[in-house]
């Protein structure tokens, strides 16, 4: 079989959902001594960036200026050392958001509510679309789909204080384009008293984990990675 | 706003040479990323040569050896130097930028690039 190196990791800095005009950047992160990464979007060659010096750093980052819904999709990355070139990462989905029109989120039957009562959120957009999504903030991979001609409803179940929080909705023209968001409604959720305190499910800042994580190598490093691979060879 | 103007084209026997040019308007010059698509008739528009702002390049297989993409930020003018033309080579030669952008990303799709020229028509006939 033909040798490959390790995949890389792809990642949307700040945020995969992108207005539209505004500028995405996309980490993909490799390896040390990578002289060559690509980026493909829906399969096809979309960029190339060659790292200076290459034993020095160990990812790129790619900028996408000027957002928009021909840019929207799903983008991979791998990166080359000598003539090696690496599996391919995962797939990352790149969103274009502020298409078109504003939806208007509500919830049933109020945004205070305790816990275990039955809680939905209707999500409604005048304009020509059938898919929709509710996202909560901080948590925006955690997308829910749901279906309707103008609105269509997100049923949460009985709640617990697990589900507060502020939430939006968008309507979405594909998988890719999505509307400008709702105003948020912020969920309150009394009850569960030993559960009251912020959650990790809370988080002050949004989508903490969607930065890249791209480091320089130093003499230190170095000096780890040689020790590190003659101790492996002196396993072996 | 970004305005790409080309010229340079016109026709060439087989193995002859041609330069194009592409001139840029505005002060952005400096941070585009610059790139050379051809669409020959009736076919898809393609991706030839691209330069980053540093000065990487990078060519499609087709034209690898043959052509040479360089950039004059004094001038506001990007080149594409052709040598070794071949009939298969006859096609509408298009300018491309993107503006801005940081790093020293190429960028090689038709997606990425926000500003485009009129295109300028090369033909290679005996």
């Known amino acids: 079989p033909k040798q490959t190196l390790p995949k890389p990791i792809i990642r949307a800095e700040s945020t995969y959902m992108v207005p539209k005009e505004k500028q995405a950047t996309l980490c993909c992160q490799g390896s040390y001594g990578a002289v060559e990464y690509q980026l493909h979007f829906e399969g096809s060659l979309f960029a190339v960036e060659r790292p200076k010096p290459p034993e020095r750093i160990n990812g790129v980052k790619f900028h996408i200026p000027d957002m928009n819904s021909r840019k929207a999709g799903r983008y991979s990355c791998i990166y080359r050392v000598g003539e090696l070139w690496s599996e391919r990462s995962d797939l990352l989905d790149l969103v274009v958001t502020e298409m078109y029109d504003t939806p208007t989120l509500s919830v049933h039957p109020g945004p205070e509510v305790t816990s275990g009562e039955k809680v939905t959120f209707y999500c409604r957009l005048d304009t020509a679309t059938s898919m929709f999504l509710l996202l909560k903030e901080g948590r925006s991979r955690d997308v829910q789909r749901s279906y309707g001609k103008v609105q269509a409803e997100f049923p949460m179940g009985p709640v617990t204080t697990a589900h507060r929080g502020s939430y939006r909705c968008f309507g979405s023209y594909n998988n890719y384009a999505w509307s400008f968001p709702s105003e948020p409604v912020k969920l309150l959720v009394t009850g569960d008293i030993e559960n009251t305190s912020l959650a990790p499910t809370d988080p002050t800042f949004p989508d903490s984990w969607d930065t890249c994580l791209l480091t320089r190598e130093t003499g230190l490093q170095k000096d780890l990675a040689l020790w590190d691979h003659t101790a492996q060879n002196l396993l072996r | 706003e970004v305005q790409l103007v080309e010229s340079g084209g016109g026709e060439v026997q087989p193995g002859g040479s041609l330069r194009l040019s592409c001139a840029a308007s505005?002060?952005?010059?400096?941070?585009?990323?610059m790139g050379w698509f051809r669409q020959a008739p009736g076919k898809e528009r393609e991706f030839v040569a691209a330069?980053?702002?540093?000065?990487?390049?990078y060519y499609a297989d087709s034209v690898k050896g043959r052509f040479t993409i360089s950039r004059d930020n004094a001038k506001n003018t990007v080149y594409l130097q052709m040598s070794s033309l071949r009939a298969e080579d006859t096609a509408v030669y298009y300018c491309?930028?993107?503006?801005?952008?940081?790093?020293?990303?190429?960028?090689?799709?038709?997606?990425?690039?926000?500003?485009w020229g009129q295109g300028t028509l090369v033909t290679v006939k005996p």
């Open positions: 491309a930028a993107v503006v801005p952008t940081y790093g020293n990303n190429i960028y090689v799709h038709s997606a990425a690039y926000n500003y």
């Open positions: 330069i980053s702002r540093s000065d990487d390049t």
């Open positions: 505005g002060r952005t010059f400096a941070s585009a990323a």
